[in-house]
C-alpha cells in the first residue's frame, strides 16, 4: 500500500478553508459524503456529512462547517468558516459506501490555524477585509457511526490560494478562501483501481 500524503495549509483565525472535493464518477453522486478529522492514534472522526442520499446543492451546516454537494458536477464543497486555532489538525473528505470502507477523495489536509489576521500568500493585499457569506438555509444530517482509517484515494490535488465573495446572507469579515483544486485522473490503470469495488487499499497517484 502506498503511504498517504498530506498537504499543509497555514491560515489565520477568522479565515475560511474552502475545499472542493472532486468525486467525478456518477455512481458516487447520491452517496453520503463526510468531512473528517484524524487525530493522532485515533480513528477518523466525522465532523459533518451530507444527507443520505446526498441531496443536490443542498447545504448542510454543522457549526462552522458547511457541506454542499453538486451532484451534476461531481463536486462536494466543504467550508470551515471563522477558523479558530483549535481547528488545527488533519482532515479528509470521504464518500461513505457501507458496508464497505469509505473512499477518500484526495490527500489529507494538515490545517494549521494561527492567531492574528493577514492576507494569504498569493491573495490580493487589498482584500483582507473580504466579506464571506454563508447560505441562509442549511440542514443538519445524521452521520453514520462507523469510521475507518482505511480509505481509497481518488487523485492528488493541485492547490491554489484565492479570495472570493460568494453571494448569500450571513456575513463574516476577515476571511480568505483557500481553494483546493483537484487534478483529474488521466491514467486508465488508476481509474481501474478507483472503480473496482474490491480494491480498498491506498493508492496515491503522482
Amino acid at each position: 500500500a502506498t503511504k498517504l500524503t498530506e498537504e499543509k495549509y497555514e491560515l489565520k483565525e477568522g479565515q475560511t478553508l474552502d475545499v472542493k472535493c472532486d468525486y467525478t464518477l456518477e455512481k458516487f453522486a447520491s452517496s453520503q459524503k463526510a468531512w473528517q478529522i484524524i487525530r493522532d492514534g485515533e480513528m477518523p472522526k466525522t465532523l459533518a456529512c451530507t444527507e443520505r442520499p446526498s441531496k443536490n446543492s443542498h447545504p448542510v451546516q454543522v457549526g462552522r462547517i458547511i457541506l454542499e454537494d453538486a451532484h451534476d458536477h461531481g463536486l462536494l464543497r466543504v467550508r470551515m468558516v471563522n477558523l479558530q486555532v483549535e481547528d488545527s489538525g488533519l482532515y479528509q473528505c470521504v464518500i461513505y459506501q457501507p458496508p464497505k470502507e469509505p473512499h477518500m477523495l484526495f490527500d489529507r489536509i494538515r490545517l494549521v490555524v494561527t492567531k492574528g489576521f493577514s492576507g494569504t500568500p498569493g491573495s490580493n493585499e487589498n482584500s483582507t477585509q473580504n466579506v464571506y457569506k454563508i447560505p441562509p438555509t442549511t440542514t443538519k444530517a445524521l452521520c453514520p457511526l462507523y469510521t475507518s482509517p482505511r480509505t481509497v484515494t481518488q487523485a492528488p490535488p493541485k492547490s491554489t490560494a484565492d479570495v472570493s465573495t460568494p453571494d448569500s446572507e450571513i456575513n463574516l469579515t476577515n476571511v480568505t478562501d483557500i481553494i483546493r483544486e483537484q487534478k483529474l485522473i488521466s491514467e486508465e490503470d488508476l481509474e481501474q483501481k478507483l472503480i473496482s469495488e474490491e480494491d480498498l487499499h491506498h493508492h496515491h497517484h503522482h
Epitope: 451532484h71 451534476d72 458536477h73 463536486l75 481553494i179 486508465e188 481509474e191
Partner: antibody, heavy 121, light 111 residues
Framework: EVQLVESGGGLVQPGGSLKLSCAAS????????MHWVRQASGKGLEWVGR??????????YYAASVKGRFTISRDDSKNTAYLQMNSLKTEDTAVYYC????????????WGQGTLVTVSS | DIVLTQSPDSLAVSLGERATINCRAS??????????LHWYQQKPGQPPKLLIY???NLESGVPDRFSGSGSGTDFTLTISSLQAEDVAVYYC?????????FGQGTKLEIK
C-alpha cells in the same frame, strides 16, 4: 489503452434513418457517460448529445438541432454506445465522433476516429 | 444555451512567438469556482485532441508551452513559443450546462 471505434456511417437519403455504433475498450464502460460530437466538412465541432450511466438512470441530453430526431442509447454488456438518427436532413452530413469524458461534466479525453454520414438524394 | 465566441477566427504567428486565443462565454461556466471550460486542438483528418481541461489544467502528455487561464466568462489559451506542429484549429468547449457547446474554432497558421 482506451479505444473508441465508430461504425455504421454511410450514404442515406433525406428523411432516412441510420444507426451508428461506438465500440469501447480499455476502460470500464459502464462507469462513464458517452457523447457524440459531429463535424461537417470544413466546419466546427458540434456536440450532439450524451448518455449518462445506470446510476443516473441512463439520462440523455441532446443539442436542439437533433432533439426529437436522434436517440442515444448504450448497452453496457456490449461496451457499446449507439446513435439512432431518424428523419435525416442534408445538414446532418458530417463526421460523427464518439467521445468519452473523464467523469461528471468533465472534459473529452478520448475520441474515436469518426464515421462519415452523408445525407443526400 | 451557452454561446462560446472565440477570437480571432484565424491567427498567423511567427515560429517561436507567442500565440493567444480567447474564448468568451455568454454566461458563466463556473460551478463552485471550477471552470468547466476546456481547450482542444484539431489537425486535418484527425479527431480533436484535449490540451487543457477546466480552464488551466494541462492534459498529460501536452507540451508545457500550452497554457490556459481565465474564469467565469473569459478564457485564454496561450502557446508561449509557437512550433511548426502547432498549426491546427483550436476549440474551446464548455461542459457546465447542457447542451454542451463548442466555440467556432480558431485557425492557427505560421506567419
Amino acid at each position: 489503452e482506451v479505444q473508441l471505434v465508430e461504425s455504421g456511417g454511410g450514404l442515406v437519403q433525406p428523411g432516412g434513418s441510420l444507426k451508428l455504433s461506438c465500440a469501447a475498450s480499455g476502460f470500464t464502460f459502464s462507469t462513464y457517460a458517452m457523447h457524440w460530437v459531429r463535424q461537417a466538412s470544413g466546419k466546427g465541432l458540434e456536440w450532439v448529445g450524451r448518455i449518462r450511466t445506470k446510476s443516473s438512470n441512463y439520462a440523455t441530453y441532446y443539442a436542439a438541432s437533433v432533439k426529437g430526431r436522434f436517440t442515444i442509447s448504450r448497452d453496457d454488456s456490449k461496451n457499446t454506445a449507439y446513435l439512432q438518427m431518424n428523419s435525416l436532413k442534408t445538414e446532418d452530413t458530417a463526421v460523427y465522433y464518439c467521445t468519452r469524458d473523464m467523469g461528471i461534466r468533465r472534459q473529452f479525453a478520448y475520441w474515436g476516429q469518426g464515421t462519415l454520414v452523408t445525407v443526400s438524394s | 444555451d451557452i454561446v462560446l465566441t472565440q477570437s480571432p477566427d484565424s491567427l498567423a504567428v511567427s515560429l517561436g512567438e507567442r500565440a493567444t486565443i480567447n474564448c468568451r462565454a455568454s454566461e458563466s461556466v463556473d460551478t463552485f469556482d471550477y471552470s468547466f471550460l476546456h481547450w482542444y486542438q484539431q489537425k486535418p483528418g484527425q479527431p480533436p485532441k484535449l490540451l487543457i481541461y477546466r480552464a488551466s489544467n494541462l492534459e498529460s502528455g501536452v507540451p508545457d508551452r500550452f497554457s490556459g487561464s481565465g474564469s467565469g466568462t473569459d478564457f485564454t489559451l496561450t502557446i508561449s513559443s509557437l512550433q511548426a506542429e502547432d498549426v491546427a484549429v483550436y476549440y474551446c468547449q464548455q461542459s457546465n450546462e447542457d447542451p454542451y457547446t463548442f466555440g467556432q474554432g480558431t485557425k492557427l497558421e505560421i506567419k
